[in-house]
Amino acid sequence: KPSNEATGNVSHSGMKKEFLHELKAENIKKFLYNFTRTPHLAGTQNNFELAKQIHDQWKEFGLDLVELSHYDVLLSYPNKTHPNYISIINEDGNEIFKTSLSEQPPPGYENISDVVPPYSAFSPQGTPEGDLVYVNYARTEDFFKLEREMKISCSGKIVIARYGKVFRGNMVKNAQLAGAKGMILYSDPADYFVPAVKSYPDGWNLPGGGVQRGNVLNLNGAGDPLTPGYPANEHAYRHELTNAVGLPSIPVHPIGYDDAQKLLEHMGGPAPPDSSWKGGLKVPYNVGPGFAGNFSTQKVKMHIHSYTKVTRIYNVIGTLKGALEPDRYVILGGHRDAWVFGGIDPQSGAAVVHEIVRSFGTLKKKGRRPRRTILFASWDAEEFGLLGSTEWAEEHSRLLQERGVAYINADSSIEGNYTLRVDCTPLMYSLVYNLTKELQSPDEGFEGKSLYDSWKEKSPSPEFIGMPRISKLGSGNDFEVFFQRLGIASGRARYTKNWKTNKVSSYPLYHSVYETYELVVKFYDPTFKYHLTVAQVRGAMVFELANSIVLPFDCQSYAVALKKYADTIYNISMKHPQEMKAYMISFDSLFSAVNNFTDVASKFNQRLQELDKSNPILLRIMNDQLMYLERAFIDPLGLPGRPFYRHIIYAPSSHNKYAGESFPGIYDALFDISSKVNASKAWNEVKRQISIATFTVQAAAETLREVA
């Protein structure tokens, strides 16, 4: 077909203008309101009803095909008749203090049923009793500090940690490795209360009774804990619960800072190792174990009665068939399930996806289809371990690895209202920079300026002068399976806070009952201009990926990134110069492969400039080289101990799932290497990981060479 038929004789830029112009802030606001009327916990009737509603609306909007895709996965819920709580007990075993069983409902929501009380999803049942040890953020380095420097053992203790800095699943894993028999997670005002801002409902700060829910799994990309690697459908073989992937082995429970005050105020033992362990409560932050002085006979007891259950979940998958390359898929996906009302997470994202679908649908109704197929997804059970997206990708992995061009994630659109935040593959850097130059900034003081201008001023790149910061992809969201397992180029964008002045972890009301529609309308984005901007960024990314004749991927940006990552890991290794020499560790091969990749990428770009775009075969060949470049970084064997993290350049940090690590295989081999008992074995593993990275970069470079 001649290409103009695909777009109804409208130019690419004209069609893009029309698409962007169709996006309306008022619609996003309306959709957000609609999606936040009731809780939408995964596996509940409410969330199934919302799935059906979205299915019907996407059909109305004009998508060619909309389907519900269901799976039966392991979920976790609190026991309604046997609530979870923590108590302080005296020497006679009497409870002298109990933590609250629920959060006070926000104004206007007093009569809403089905608000799940705060809990740590997938915590096992148990009633451990013992002395408390305060472990700061429960990071790897916090336990090193405790055990190695302060000589404090957590073995047989109940540990209490403040949320923030790292993914809560990593906190629990660290506590388990330290021998703890239970874990309490709490939100400290230092991390969830910004000075001079009022608590909800008068402001956007966390009140003392507010609590962060969340799963405490360590799935490492496995998806449903009972069906790792395969879709959890009716034919699936399911592991016994004892062999499930990533479940914690100790009871875990979250509390707010009012309750934490009571647990921490009489802590004994030494003072914290340094002032970075002190939070914002009026307590000494003594480490323990146990209480001080007259309180030393008191103990802490956890009462956890949550249960796991195989439960049906529902993704909504919408298809807009491509006019010219229907076998090439650009995916826009975000989750629908929420812990409670989901005012920000996820519905500020779901509302944006809804409006993007509506705009693409409007174009299609006018006869203007995208060049490539666009798949839209409303994922379920993201909060329970990225289950909906992972199961769907497992089911369709063969199609995705052959046809997947890109995945754009669409969880929360806002976590602040200061500036843009983007994490993506280097392949998308220039795409993002270019499209933000064409969009208006919504920021005060930047009227008439581009989004790129405000973004680069407020969030400058630490490496490249005059450019905005783009971060590495980590995990903790639905792009994980697409990027880390399948090697599909991925990206995400949202509006964020000012990290320089606002030290809080995430936004204060994250995963609490107070994350409501009113929170967004009153305090974050009254006019929905930031939501609209995020819709434009996400929408424009999808539009360009689906409509550009040549895929808007820049392999030279990947070359620059690889050079930086090689330098970084080399510098880490060079902190051990004697061992490097003794065990003959060399990075020469890796640097050589990176140089080769750089050379090949440069030549590829030259050929791309000279490409005859009217020749569909030559065009498809080069587009395929671009599409498959991300795939080339996938190692079928995966990373050590993490078979579903297969990307050799990027993986979620082993110490914080949310953060991305570059050359993760080498990084993990080097981590804490000086304390390894068998130094020779440890450095041998470093050598092996360097060779894997070298081979992978070299092999990826080869895919960019002229095909014959």
């Epitope: 000589k151 404090i152 004994g268 030494p270 000494p284 932050y285 002085g293």
Partner: antibody, heavy 123, light 108 residues
Amino acid sequence: QVQLQESGPGLVKPSVTLSLTCTVSGASFSSSGYYWGWIRQTPGKGLEWIGTMFYSGATYYNPSLKSRLTLNMDTSKQEFTLRLTSVTAEDSAVYYCVRHRGPDTGLDAFDLWGQGTQVTVSS
Amino acid sequence: DVEMTQSPASLSLSPGERATLSCRASQSVSSDLAWYQQKPGQAPRLLIYGASTRATGIPARFSGSGSGTEFTLAISSLQSEDFAVYYCQQYNNWPPLTFGGGTKLEIK
């Protein structure tokens, strides 16, 4: 009444290890909940906190001295020792044994001081 | 590290006069600040902790104020035994605990 008494060599040669002992009378390390530390004073640098220790074995060191410093406590002898390796003329100072205000107030102000001992590093 | 800056470096006053000594922290130390007095040949002595609380046995003429980064030690009516060197110290942010350079209060 609690008293602190520093003891150690007045003169130390460069590059050797300085060892000082603080003897505490009138209070038990392990039952008191107090933190015990060392401070030094030079005409040039003024008062400088060296480090602090708790009876549990937890130590808190000045980062500028951490690589050379070890604090130890012998609860049976009621003694608290400082070891500073590879000393130079820069380490010449009056060394004070101190107690942090307390009990159970952590690394707070210093409410009790020994009379101090002059250490000179010279060949 | 939190730097503590004391001013003035020296101050000459007569007995009976009021002395005002300042201490500035390079970042907020909340009210975790102490004041000490040191006389020649002696160890320092704790006067004030928590920015404004007098230590045991310290006369009422000594008072401390301030929070965050700006602190003041006032001696309402100077006695002959008050002429000494005064140091401030923060214990909010550590390691290290840090002291000011001192203010020498001399008899005029």
